[in-house]
């Protein structure tokens, strides 16, 4: 069964800086990946990036970078205006679209120990949600 | 404008085998996802096969696995449905039809249909 | 695979009623739901896609909306033109699937 990881990361050098990370784990082609916060889109979240592998990416603010890492990966690039850091508590999702087997989407969020000060980036681990 | 024409419908003998065509035109064919959908006399609606606008993957409705083969040439922009070894619940009105992945793979563009009765 | 069940199958209004068409999915199909018309003699036409977006030259009368299994899909002032059937249609998962229709006719 095809499955969604997410992970978030907050920037060592920027408080302010987040990234976003997303992978599809299974059998075939990518058609659209769209990462959205506070929730799934369409269910109470908000829309941060749409990406396609052939016609390119479209993001809204706070999203600074959408770009694919892999074929079946992307990253999002968040720039935190606010001083209190509302991205810490904030709930990720990403959706995964493939033709013509369907969606795949998973949310996560910031770990709560995360202290960037005290290590590098963790490694990508998976946090996995089934089924929205 | 984008269009899609489908050809090559007709009546056939049970156990017979037709050849559907749909012509595209309007569009960057090789860059849509594609589908056959047909509405039964009942008027239901049902997606027979599909395929992805890069051919790696092809979906089948479960009652026409191993009978119907959708193909596509994309230097042609034409979709085919070779359907083989036809049942009477096959009489149907098919369509061809076009995905949009920013709709979430809605169908926005399909063609007139054309029409395949089975007799027996 | 994914069964849409869609309620009613009949509708028999007159210009100016509101309506409303439901759509359970018989699982979570989140927001990937779309809406067909056909009107009588032509091939189905997009209407909505990701439940509540209007596909171009739709007017605003047609409205969208749920999450999950339950879709609603209302017309806020039925006019003439609206005599056809409406289908709703989950692109979640393979296969994709279709209800069964609502016949919207005109008193």
């Known amino acids: 069964t095809p499955e969604v990881w997410v992970q978030v990361q907050m920037e060592a050098t920027e408080l302010s800086s987040f990234t976003v990370h997303c992978g599809f784990l299974g059998p075939g082609s990518i058609s659209l990946v769209t990462v959205s916060w506070g929730g799934p889109d369409g269910a109470g979240g908000t829309k941060l990036a749409v990406l396609h592998p052939e016609l390119g990416t479209r993001q809204w603010a706070p999203a600074r970078q959408a770009r694919w890492e892999t074929q079946s990966s992307i990253s999002l690039a968040l720039e935190d205006s606010g001083a209190s850091s509302p991205f810490a508590n904030t709930t990720f999702c990403c959706k995964f679209a493939s033709f013509p087997e369907g969606s795949w989407e998973s949310c996560g969020s910031l770990p709560p120990s995360s202290d960037p000060g005290l290590s590098a980036p963790p490694t990508p681990v998976p946090i996995l949600r089934a089924d929205l | 404008d984008v269009k899609l024409v489908e050809s090559g419908g007709g009546l056939v003998k049970l156990g017979g085998s037709l050849k559907l065509s749909c012509a595209a035109s309007?569009?960057?064919?090789?860059?849509?996802?594609m589908s056959w959908v047909r509405q039964t006399p009942e008027k239901r609606l049902e997606l027979v096969a599909a395929?992805?606008?890069?051919?790696?993957?092809?979906y089948y409705l479960d009652t026409v696995k191993g009978r119907f083969t959708i193909s596509r040439d994309n230097a042609k922009n034409t979709l085919y449905l070779q359907m083989s070894s036809l049942k009477s619940e096959d009489t149907a009105l098919y369509y061809c039809?076009?995905?949009?992945?920013?709709?979430?793979?809605?169908?926005?563009?399909w063609g007139q249909g054309t029409s395949v009765t089975v007799s027996s | 695979s994914i069964v849409m069940t869609q309620t009613p199958k009949f509708l028999l209004v007159s210009a100016g009623d509101r309506v409303t068409i439901t759509c359970k999915a018989s699982?979570?199909?989140?927001?990937?739901v779309a809406w067909y018309q056909q009107k009588p003699g032509q091939s189905p036409k997009l209407l909505m896609y990701?439940?509540?977006n209007h596909y171009t030259g739709v007017p605003d009368r047609f409205i969208g909306s749920g999450y999950g299994t339950d879709f609603t899909f209302t017309i806020s002032t039925v006019q003439a033109e609206d005599l056809a059937v409406y289908f709703c249609?989950?692109?979640?998962?393979?296969?994709?699937?279709f209800g069964g229709g609502t016949k919207l006719e005109i008193k």
């Open positions: 039809a076009r995905h949009e992945d920013y709709y979430g793979f809605a169908m926005d563009y």
């Open positions: 249609q989950q692109a979640y998962r393979s296969p994709w699937t």
């Open positions: 990701y439940v509540s």
């Open positions: 395929i992805n606008s890069n051919v790696i993957s092809t």
């Open positions: 699982q979570s199909v989140t927001n990937d």
């Open positions: 309007g569009f960057t064919f090789s860059s849509y996802h």
